[in-house]
């Protein structure tokens, strides 16, 4: 599992392999913070619940982040 044990970033390695949406259980988005300078995307796969860190610079994830922030601005009070 590519998750670090430090209190800084959660991901220590990033998968550049494209993720098939059918194999995804969920995606967790951890925004950049004082503990970790970069946004982190953690994919939980349907099979065996394996966790994978995805590349936030990939086109697919950029599209996803754009959609999430759009959704966020619609719903924020």
């Amino acid at each position: 599992v590519p998750l670090s044990r430090t209190v800084r970033c959660t991901c220590i390695s990033i998968s550049n392999q494209p993720v098939n949406p059918r194999s995804l259980e969920k995606l967790e988005i951890i925004p950049a913070s004082q503990f970790c300078p970069r946004v982190e995307i953690i994919a939980t796969m349907k099979k065996k619940g394996e966790k994978r860190c995805l590349n936030p610079e990939s086109k697919a994830i950029k599209n996803l982040l754009k959609a999430v922030s759009k959704e966020r601005s619609k719903r924020s009070p």
Epitope: P18, P21, E25
Partner: antibody
């Protein structure tokens, strides 16, 4: 309103190429998967494949793998089904339909979650007929 | 040959209750949900039941679905003449990595 409109069908000679279009309106195109299904005369529905425009990834039924290409253009909310060489057995009514939906939860927390819910094909186009004949 | 097995035909008189079965395996219905579609003559299919037993808005409660093990069922109670159509079950198949349909059941209202 929410709709899908197919176009591009007609009578085509065997061996010719063809591209069908599926124009979406009334919903956020990239937040769903778009599926292609066919209904050959006298037979039942067949799933050809699907594309998730947000990820740009297509899945194909084994039978159609390498025979067709599914793509999407997010900028114009349109999905495509393409053949480079049609066969008589490709004669069918072709439908596009909306499937998996991206749902965002915990939006206002510092860890939003995204899930993709495949709750069935809830919006269908009117269909476009492809007849492959010489 | 379809991956999911449905009876090719079913019939009933107005007001009757009709059940259409859909049999699969552990790689499709056994581990995924069942959806049902209605295809009226000359029209595009429409979603009748999703997630085994859920009805989309606008679908009358005469239509109900259930799943047990590797099989699904569609029940139409209080049959009406406008229910005459082809009915298809569908599921995702983990082995084939694709959506699979039943062969369809032609329902005749006598």
């Amino acid at each position: 309103q929410v709709q899908l409109v197919e176009s591009g069908g007609g009578v085509v000679q065997p061996g010719r190429s063809l591209r069908l279009s599926c124009a979406a309106s009334g919903f956020t195109f990239s937040s769903f998967s778009i599926t292609w299904i066919r209904d050959p005369p006298g037979k039942g529905l067949e799933w050809i494949g699907e594309i998730t425009p947000m990820f740009g990834i297509a899945n194909y039924a084994q039978k159609f793998q390498g025979q067709v290409t599914i793509s999407a253009d997010k900028s114009i909310s349109t999905a495509y089904l393409q053949w480079s060489s049609l066969k008589a057995s490709d004669t069918a009514m072709y439908y596009c339909a909306r499937d998996g939906r991206f749902d965002v939860s915990d939006l206002l927390t510092d860890k939003p979650k995204v899930t993709i819910n495949y709750n069935g094909m809830d919006v269908w186009g009117q269909g476009t007929l492809v007849t492959v004949s010489s | 040959q379809s991956v999911l097995t449905q009876p090719p035909s079913a019939s009933g008189t107005p007001g009757q209750r009709v059940t259409i079965s859909c049999s699969g395996s552990s790689s499709n219905i056994g581990s995924n949900t069942v959806n049902w579609y209605q295809e009226l003559p000359g029209a595009a299919p429409q979603l009748l039941i999703y997630n085994n037993d859920q009805r989309p808005s606008g679908i009358p409660d005469r239509f109900s679905g259930s799943k047990s093990g590797t099989s699904g069922s569609l029940v139409i109670s209080g049959l009406q003449s406008e229910d005459e159509a082809d009915y298809y079950c569908a599921s995702w198949d983990d082995s084939l990595n694709g959506r699979v349909f039943g062969g369809g059941t032609k329902l005749t209202v006598l």
